[in-house]
């Protein structure tokens, strides 16, 4: 379900007419500080037992307009010895995120919020062996 | 070659107004599908080489309100015995997502966009071992 | 002020590499992705490939995959491209610009001022 | 690959004249981009998502077009305004520029 804010500002406020249309200023606000950004590292991509690689999605009717995806490079998990491991899977970790779409047509901009299933890196888990009945 | 998708502008739009200051419909449009949300595997978090939990991060005047965020159970993965391999560390992934907020006493309800460094899923990469000078 | 700065021309040989660096200042460096485009001599402008500073991925136009390698270092807000197995051909000016990743209505808006690179016996 | 023609090549006016430069695509794109070079400078972004002057830009230049045609126009030719113009597709990989028109005074 949609949360609507916790505000003691709007009293009766008609929770269906607040969500159909409010106000969002687009400049977006870094609360991460420049230094949490830099820490981020971005070559786990290549050192994980379960690397992965980064696709480039662009639309430019979404906000944000550019999201890079993540793909798992192997089905398996590859070893110590630099080899694939037939008894580990490499997994892609998804995660659900909201982005918002322009409607067409619509002359000043209106957007409405979609949710969208994104990559963002892999894991390595042990294959489920399926028994036999 | 990959399409990026078409869009129609808006002719004379003053760009920086228009992202100053955009209508949205906050009510979730799910492109995703119940299907493709359905079969989104839960349990990577246990059975992966780099184990994770969730933990629930909640703002009320936040949109969305509610987020999972993943933390590593360990700093080392966890070899095929069950036993934490010290020259394997297990890595937080971690994406940027925008979220909105709501603007203090804004009546009716404004938000501005702000970018949040969240903990998806975990990772198993190879210790590197800094060579003394 | 928004400024993209380049390091200085280049004088290579043919088979070599170079590594042409992209200092960026006056805004927040992983907001935007950093696009690598090159014009040689009295020649049009050629889209080499594009690097995001945040994720690290990168896209590159097929000419070039496999010889040009476009990394970022968010730490000093500095992306780099370089490109390998140089030819005669690659003498140009490369140039970096920078690219909003949330809303690319905007296209590129600020480039760099170009480095030189001469590939020269 | 998309290939972005742009006609003329080369263009010789006078101070006040109207110019228009065309841009044909060899498909359907979304927006186009206009940059503006002058010799031994690099390009500035000149006219975005195809009807948008980039700040700075005197409003005698406008952009227009959609689908496989696209124009930049200049109203009133000034001085400054004598430079190399390209337009530039972003709708398909790998991204492309037109060849450029030279505009020099007649």
């Known amino acids: 379900a949609a949360i609507i804010p916790q505000s003691s500002a709007c009293p009766n406020t008609e929770a269906k007419d607040f969500l159909q249309n409010v106000k969002v200023n687009l400049k977006v606000f870094n609360s991460l500080g420049a230094k949490v950004s830099s820490r981020r590292p971005s070559d786990y991509l290549n050192r994980s037992t379960s690397p992965w690689t980064l696709h480039r999605n662009e639309d430019p009717d979404r906000y944000p307009s550019v999201i890079w995806e993540a793909q798992c490079r192997h089905q398996r998990c590859v070893n110590a010895e630099g080899k694939l491991d037939h008894h580990m899977n490499s997994v892609l970790i998804q995660q659900e995120i909201l982005v918002l779409k322009r409607e067409p047509e619509s002359c000043p901009f209106t957007f409405r919020v979609e949710k969208m299933l994104v990559g963002v890196g892999c894991t390595c888990v042990a294959s489920i062996v399926r028994q036999a009945a | 070659a990959a399409i990026i998708p078409q869009s129609s502008a808006c002719p004379n739009t003053e760009a920086k107004d228009f992202l100053q200051n955009v209508k949205v419909n906050l009510k979730v449009f799910n492109s995703l599908g119940a299907k493709v949300s359905s079969r989104r595997p839960s349990d990577y978090l246990n059975r992966s080489t780099s184990p994770w939990t969730l933990h629930r991060n909640e703002d009320p005047d936040r949109y969305p309100s509610v987020i999972w965020e993943a933390q590593c159970r360990h700093q080392r993965c966890v070899n095929a015995e069950g036993k934490l391999d010290h020259h394997m560390n297990s890595v937080l992934i971690q994406q940027e997502i925008l979220v909105l907020k709501r603007e203090p006493e804004s009546c009716p309800f404004t938000f501005r966009v702000e970018k949040m460094l969240v903990g998806v899923g975990c990772t198993c990469v190879a210790s590197i071992v800094r060579q003394a000078a | 002020e928004v400024q993209l700065v380049q390091s200085g021309a280049e004088v290579k040989k043919p088979g070599s590499s170079v590594k042409v660096s992209c200092k960026a200042s006056?805004?927040?460096?992983?907001?935007?992705?950093i696009h690598w485009v090159r014009q040689a001599p009295g020649q049009g402008l050629e889209w080499i490939g594009v690097?995001?500073?945040?994720?690290?991925?990168?896209f590159y136009n097929q000419k070039f995959d496999g010889r040009a390698t476009l990394t970022a270092d968010k730490s000093t807000s500095t992306a780099y491209m370089e490109l390998s197995s140089l030819r005669s051909e690659d003498t140009a000016v490369y140039y970096c610009?920078?690219?909003?990743?949330?809303?690319?209505?905007?296209?590129?808006?600020?480039w760099g001022q170009g480095t030189t690179v001469t590939v020269s016996s | 690959d998309i290939q972005l023609t742009q006609s003329p090549s080369s263009l010789s006016a006078s101070v006040g004249d109207r110019v228009t430069i065309t841009c044909s695509a060899s498909?359907?794109?979304?927006?186009i981009y206009w940059f503006q070079q002058k010799p031994g400078k690099s390009p500035k972004r000149w006219i975005y998502?195809?009807?948008e002057l980039a700040s700075g830009v005197p409003s005698r230049f406008s952009g227009s077009g959609s689908g496989t045609d696209y124009t930049l126009t200049i109203s009133s030719l000034q001085p400054e305004d004598f430079a190399t113009y390209y337009c530039?597709?972003?709708?398909?990989?790998?991204?492309?520029f037109g060849q450029g028109t030279k505009l020099e005074i007649k």
């Open positions: 610009t920078r690219y909003y990743r949330y809303e690319s209505f905007y296209g590129m808006d600020y």
């Open positions: 006056g805004y927040t460096f992983t907001d935007y992705e």
């Open positions: 690097n995001d500073p945040e994720s690290g991925g990168t």
């Open positions: 498909s359907s794109i979304s927006y």
């Open positions: 998502a195809t009807f």
């Open positions: 530039h597709q972003r709708s398909s990989y790998p991204w492309t």
